[in-house]
Amino acid sequence: FNISGCSTKKLLWTYSTRSEEEFVLFCDLPEPQKSHFCHRNRLSPKQVPEHLPFMGSNDLSDVQWYQQPSNGDPLEDIRKSYPHIIQDKCTLHFLTPGVNNSGSYICRPKMIKSPYDVACCVKMILEVKPQTNASCEYSASHKQDLLLGSTGSISCPSLSCQSDAQSPAVTWYKNGKLLSVERSNRIVVDEVYDYHQGTYVCDYTQSDTVSSWTVRAVVQVRTIVGDTKLKPDILDPVEDTLEVELGKPLTISCKARFGFERVFNPVIKWYIKDSDLEWEVSVPEAKSIKSTLKDEIIERNIILEKVTQRDLRRKFVCFVQNSIGNTTQSVQLKEKRG
């Protein structure tokens, strides 16, 4: 098809050689009056679209992406030729940075519903460069963490070395949707929730005397739990005595709750106290029985093949520990009467 009628957009991806980062291209289809495919959201110029133009009520995920070879060869279908590029709906994800990603990318609807739709396409000229600005050594990462329940911020990596005052107007997207109220180089989050997690894109325009282009960066944002400030607590056993039958097998379970730690080395073990002696018991491995964002519940059992008279004089102690501290719970066996 003839791409001369496609609207054109120039983008710059400046990648850091120190970190893994991704990049995205959106199929920003134009909205000419005649084309019903492109003319998704009927907005006045003053209105800001809640979604990108191609994400209207109809199914707009049906777009085709091509790359235009620099030698003038025919357009190449992205999916067939570029394994490091993934198409997700109307977005093209570049999984690895590199100057070899530079080039012209064209998207257009797969379904051409009218003669007007032929011209409904967008050509993106992408220039990819390694970051050379040594003065900005501490630019924001392309992977940023937000602590759940606290205040946080998401910084645009390509602008994080500039003060808010000198920063140009920034356009932010989250998971492909325009964040219309955000215009600064930093998004401030008053209280962090799970839904703040996602892929953020920040764009700003740079110009010289000849032309202007969009500088884009992609930030993967995770919401994380802060490391616990508490030592683990033992959920079971609750009682410090346990009625047993002599000669019968017995399993005592120790269940403990450990709060989130990024470096997690939980300890849960059983030992036996007999008058002045105490020793650790070789018991089956501990296992996690419940795992949530905030805590991990780990269980470890002690198994006695048969309860003896000697066991009644002993204390069975469950010991649990994390980096903050430890907790113990002891159990004394008592013979069942009757």
Partner: nanobody, 116 residues
Framework: QVQLQESGGGSVQPGGSLRLSCAAS????????MGWFRQAPGKERERVAS???????TYADSVNGRFTIAQDTAKNTLYLQMDSLKPEDTAMYYC??????????WGQGTQVTVSS
């Protein structure tokens, strides 16, 4: 330091079999779930199979009946037996451990290639 190390990948013809192993070290307990994932070129990473501490297993529809996940807790090793392999099973295979509500600990991966 908790670590996972996969092995057993390689090249095989369609219809063939492979057994992947994942050696876990540094864990002081058995995680709630252990899983096998795979990522083919140009595709998102997908969960292939997972196993719970109680031994119950789940499989992706695409591998159900062909792949078997198993765990040897005494050897701290997770396995994936892959039978009746197809070209579409070609991918990098990763072993992962579940911690604090997510698969957070990952191995480096082992490559599986199925072609005639």
């Amino acid at each position: 330091q908790v670590q996972l190390q996969e092995s057993g990948g390689g090249s095989v013809q369609p219809g063939g079999s492979l057994r992947l192993s994942c050696a876990a070290s540094g864990f002081t307990y058995i995680p709630a779930y252990m899983g096998w994932f795979r990522q083919a070129p140009g595709k998102e990473r997908e969960r292939v199979a997972s196993i719970k501490t109680d031994g119950s297993t789940t499989y992706a529809d695409s591998v159900n009946g062909r792949f078997t996940i198993a765990q040897d807790t005494a050897k701290n090793t997770l396995y994936l037996q892959m039978d009746s392999l197809k070209p579409e099973d070609t991918a990098m295979y990763y072993c992962a451990a579940y911690q604090f509500g997510a698969f957070r600990v990952w191995g480096q991966g082992t490559q599986v290639t199925v072609s005639s």
